[in-house]
Interface confidence: medium
C-alpha cells in the first residue's frame, strides 16, 4: 500500500513542545506531533514537539522502537500532550536508568 501523499495545503496542528529544541516555547505548530524517549549516556531523555514538514516525520514516525530510542507520532491539536514514548522491555524487570526531561 502506498504512503498517503501530503495535501497541497496540509493541516497544521498545535503540539506540546518539551526539550532543548523548544527554546522557551512550550508549544509548536506542525503537520505531525511527536513524543520521544532516547537513551543517552545512561539517561532517559524525553522530548516532545512537532514535525513542520510532512517528509521530516515520515521516516521517524515509522521507525519501530529500539532498545535506545522510541518515537510516537500523532495528528491532532495537542495530541502528544498525554503520550509518553516507551522503550521496549523484555523479561524480568530491573532498575532502570535515570530520567531527565530536558527543559
Amino acid at each position: 500500500m502506498e504512503d498517503e501523499k501530503p495535501k497541497v495545503n496540509p493541516k497544521l496542528y498545535m503540539c506540546v513542545c518539551e526539550g532543548l529544541s523548544c527554546g522557551n516555547e512550550d508549544h509548536c505548530e506542525g503537520q505531525q506531533c511527536f513524543s520521544s524517549l532516547s537513551i543517552n549516556d545512561g539517561f532517559h531523555v524525553y522530548q516532545k514537539g512537532c514535525f513542520q514538514v510532512y517528509e521530516q516525520g515520515k521516516m521517524t514516525c515509522k521507525t519501530p522502537p529500539s532498545p535506545g530510542q522510541a518515537v510516537e507520532c500523532c495528528q491532532g491539536d495537542w495530541c502528544n500532550r498525554n503520550i509518553t514514548a516507551q522503550l521496549p522491555t523484555k523479561g524480568k524487570s530491573f532498575p532502570g536508568t535515570q530520567n531527565f526531561h530536558l527543559e
Partner: antibody
C-alpha cells in the same frame, strides 16, 4: 564487596576551591550512572549532581550550577566533584552514590525509574573564614 | 521543582508498634519514581524501597511502601530497636530529583 569511598573534604574559606574524589570498588564502575548528594549539618538530603556512564552527560542542582563540576575517570574507577567559589551554605557532608542502571543482556531497557542503591560514607566540607 | 513533604516530622514509638510515615508530592508522580531511604546518625542513607513498593534486597519484610499520584506511605509493621532512625522519601519523576525533609523515629 561493592564500596564507595569519598575523600578530599576539609576546611576552606569562602570563595575557595576543593576537589572531592570517590573511589569505587567491587563493581564495573563505567557501567553506572553516579551522583553526588550532600547533607548540611542537622539538615536533610540535597541532590547535587549526576554524571552518565561516559561522563559526556552531566546535570546539576541550580544551587551549584556554574560553580561545581562533576567528572569521572573510568580507568581509575573514580568520581570527582570540583567545587569552586565555595559559600558558607555549601558546608555539608558530601556523599557519592551509585545508581543501579542495569540493562538486559538483549540490550532492552526497563524504564523509567531510578534511585541510589550504594552510598559512600561521606566526606565533610566546611566553608568558613 | 517537585516539593516532597513528609509527615510527621518526628514521632515517638515503642518496639513492636506499627509506624506509618506519609510523603506528599506537590504534583502527581508515577509510582516508579518514588524511593524511601533510612539514615542513622553519622551514617550514609540506606535504600529501603524503590518504585514506591519494591523492597530492596536484604531489607526486612516489616518494611513496606505503597501509594501513587501525590500520596505515598512507608509502613513499619512491627518496630524493632534497629529501626530508630530518620526516613526520607525521594522523587525522581522530573530532574532535579528532590527529597522530603525527613521523619525522625525516636524511642518513646
Amino acid at each position: 564487596e561493592v564500596q564507595l569511598l569519598e575523600s578530599g573534604g576539609g576546611l576552606v574559606q569562602p570563595g575557595g576551591s576543593l576537589r572531592l574524589s570517590c573511589a569505587a570498588s567491587g563493581f564495573t564502575f563505567g557501567r553506572f550512572v553516579m551522583h553526588w548528594v550532600r547533607q548540611a549539618p542537622g539538615k536533610g538530603l540535597e541532590w547535587v549532581s549526576v554524571i552518565g556512564y561516559s561522563g559526556s552527560s552531566t546535570y546539576y542542582a541550580d544551587s551549584v550550577k556554574g560553580r561545581f563540576t562533576i567528572s569521572r575517570d573510568n580507568s581509575k574507577n573514580t568520581l570527582y566533584l570540583q567545587m569552586n567559589s565555595l559559600r558558607a551554605e555549601d558546608t555539608a557532608v558530601y556523599y557519592c552514590a551509585r545508581e543501579p542502571g542495569y540493562y538486559y543482556p538483549s540490550g532492552y531497557y526497563r524504564g523509567p525509574g531510578y534511585w541510589m542503591d550504594v552510598w559512600g560514607q561521606g566526606t565533610l566540607v566546611t566553608v568558613s573564614s | 521543582d517537585i516539593q516532597m513533604t513528609q509527615s510527621p516530622s518526628s514521632l515517638s514509638a515503642s518496639v513492636g508498634d506499627r509506624v506509618t510515615i506519609t510523603c506528599r508530592a506537590s504534583q502527581g508522580i508515577s509510582g516508579n519514581w518514588l524511593t524511601w531511604y533510612q539514615q542513622k546518625p553519622g551514617k550514609a542513607p540506606k535504600l529501603l524501597i524503590y518504585d514506591a513498593s519494591n523492597l530492596q534486597s536484604g531489607v526486612p519484610s516489616r518494611f513496606s511502601g505503597s501509594g501513587s499520584g501525590t500520596d505515598f506511605t512507608l509502613t513499619i509493621s512491627s518496630l524493632q530497636p534497629e529501626d530508630f532512625a530518620t526516613y526520607y522519601c525521594h522523587q525522581s519523576y522530573r530532574g532535579p530529583m528532590t527529597f522530603g525533609q525527613g521523619t525522625k523515629v525516636e524511642i518513646k
